[in-house]
Interface confidence: low
């Protein structure tokens, strides 16, 4: 059988080889498609509801005014010429529809190195047969399940048109120290051969390198945080990170309304200054980090101060400052 591909919605003419160019003709078309149960026979006389789907032209060819998915199948013509010689034509018809240009939706504008990130979802609508979606990085194909690449695919079929919608969600784990501005694109490859791939516009998310979290140290002077009334306590927040982050101060879990500073001086200590203090370092490229908490207390004359201030965990981990 001769393979024929026809675009959905367009006309198709199949020639009946060996048929006389004009009537009277002795020919018969047999169809086995999605519209028929087993074989359907069409003759030049035609007539009836089938004329809107397929009819025999005066020259013996079969004419389909608008090919649909149901027209996929086998078409056979048997013709006898004026000398009584019989000729058979045999066609296998497959239909296709090229979708609109695929698009990347929900695309990320920024990715974080070293952790899985959703890059975006590639969507192709209106294809037949379904075809496939594939992702590219800097023009080279990305292989799922390799080097931190994973792809989630979904195929849906329109209940009325029978056309396919494909979705492909790309997740990647960018390497630390890699390309800060990778180029991703997605392409649709048709299910039928000889049709070129359709490619999306590229996206170029920025890859950010997270700054490694380093311990925030809180140093209290005098050591232990116990001081006589009217004394001075100096709290110093030490962060190894560069450039220096913003330092805010907390007392009893509440932000103190002070400008950012790595040093907090409590002069002329009074009862109102007693409590649990901690500092919060906010670096430009990651969330806030809180230090351990230290307890500041007043020693009444004659009292022995603790050798070390009571120290508690922050209990907050990360927090959003008011």
């Amino acid at each position: 059988a001769q393979n024929i591909t026809a675009r959905i919605g367009e006309p198709l003419v199949l020639k009946c080889k060996g048929a006389p160019k004009k009537p009277p003709q002795r020919l018969e078309w047999k169809l086995n498609t999605g519209r028929t149960e087993a074989w359907k026979v069409l003759s030049p006389q035609g007539g009836g509801p089938w004329d809107s789907v397929a009819r025999v032209l005066p020259n013996g060819s079969l004419f389909l005014p608008a090919v649909g998915i149901q027209d996929e199948g086998i078409f056979r013509c048997q013709a006898m010429n004026r000398n009584g010689k019989e000729t058979k034509s045999n066609y296998r018809v497959r239909v296709y529809q090229i979708p609109g240009k695929p698009e990347i939706v929900d695309s990320a504008s920024e990715l974080t190195a070293g952790v899985p990130n959703k890059v975006g979802t590639c969507v192709s609508e209106g294809s037949y047969p379904a075809g496939t979606l594939s992702w590219h990085l800097d023009g080279k194909p990305l292989v799922p399940n390799e080097k931190g690449v994973s792809v989630k695919e979904q195929t849906r079929r329109h209940p009325e048109t029978g056309l396919f919608t494909l979705q492909s969600e790309l997740m990647v784990t960018p390497a630390r120290g890699g390309d800060p501005r990778p180029t991703f694109s997605c392409s649709f490859s048709p299910g039928l051969p000889r049709h070129r791939a359709l490619r999306t516009a590229p996206i170029q998310p920025r890859v950010w390198e997270p700054v490694p979290l380093e311990e925030v140290q809180l140093v209290v002077e005098p050591e232990g945080g116990a001081v006589a009334p009217g004394g001075t306590v100096t709290l110093t927040c030490e962060v190894p990170a560069q450039p220096s982050p913003q330092i805010h101060w907390m007392k009893d879990g509440v932000p103190l309304p002070l400008p950012p500073s790595p040093v907090l001086i409590l002069p002329e200590i009074g009862p109102q200054d007693q409590g649990t203090y901690s500092c919060v370092a906010t670096h430009s490229s990651h969330g806030p980090q809180e230090s351990r908490a230290v307890s500041i207390s007043i020693i009444e004359p004659g009292e022995e101060g603790p050798t070390a201030g009571s120290v508690g965990g922050s209990g907050l981990g990360t927090l959003a400052l008011a």
């Epitope: 504008s109 920024e110 920025r206 490229s285």
Partner: antibody
């Protein structure tokens, strides 16, 4: 037509605060990294702050770290620069600029807003 | 920090001249260099990015070259409207950016 319009500049005393705004129009603001760049009275250009397109990441030079905060509101197409503990050396013309080109040159600049820190 | 040095603060030129403005980086920045033009009373305008790529709408008399540490902006046929300040900028360490001090083109 791409437009970046800065506002909020003025005269402020040392130690004071000021908030600059930059209203963007004519381009996909939420896809662009945005920066503040200042030009000193001696005409030198100095980078002040950068914020990523989604607003998750910010970066500053040591000279303003801890005193200046860059932020953005993508719904309002607006970029901000909160400046506190201002010093005389912060006196400059402040420009907002966008970076869309993949290599991160600054392709669009506003007309600038003047900040003078003086007692 | 990467320092960008424009050794010539001023350059005297005439209409029709070929002018070369140089910029030196304190360390290798690859081709992550941009050039900007600033006319009096105006904001800077991007001319060249990635060391040699001309930005949209920039006349082809402007050419950028160089890589590593040495970069040049060349104006092949100087016009009076090209009288301006020219700044180089590196973004190899993006988002940490640095500019050169600028070179002012003046008429002889």
């Amino acid at each position: 037509e791409v437009k970046l319009v800065e506002s909020g500049g003025g005269l402020v005393k040392p130690g004071g605060s000021l908030k600059l705004s930059c209203a963007a129009s004519g381009f996909a603001f939420s896809s662009y990294d945005m920066s503040w760049v200042r030009q000193t009275p001696e005409k030198r250009l100095e980078w002040v702050a950068t914020i990523s397109s989604g607003g998750s990441y910010t970066s500053y030079p040591d000279s303003v770290q801890g005193r200046f905060t860059i932020s953005r509101d993508n719904a309002r197409n607006t970029l901000y620069l909160q400046m506190s503990s201002l010093r005389s050396e912060d006196t400059a013309l402040y420009y907002c600029a966008s970076s869309q080109l993949p290599p991160y040159a600054m392709d669009y600049w506003g007309q600038g807003t003047s900040v003078t820190v003086s007692s | 920090d990467i320092v960008m040095t424009q050794s010539q603060k001023f350059m005297s030129t005439s209409v029709g001249d070929r002018v070369s403005i140089t910029c030196k980086a304190s360390q290798n920045v690859g081709t992550a260099v941009a050039w900007y033009q600033q006319k009096p009373g105006q904001s800077p305008k991007l001319l060249i990015y990635s060391a040699s790529n001309r930005y949209t709408g920039v006349p082809d008399r402007f050419t950028g070259s160089g890589s590593g540490t040495d970069f040049t902006l060349t104006i092949s046929n100087m016009q009076s409207e090209d009288l301006a300040d020219y700044f180089c900028q590196q973004y190899s360490s993006y988002p940490l950016l640095t500019f050169g001090a600028g070179t002012k083109l003046e008429l002889k």
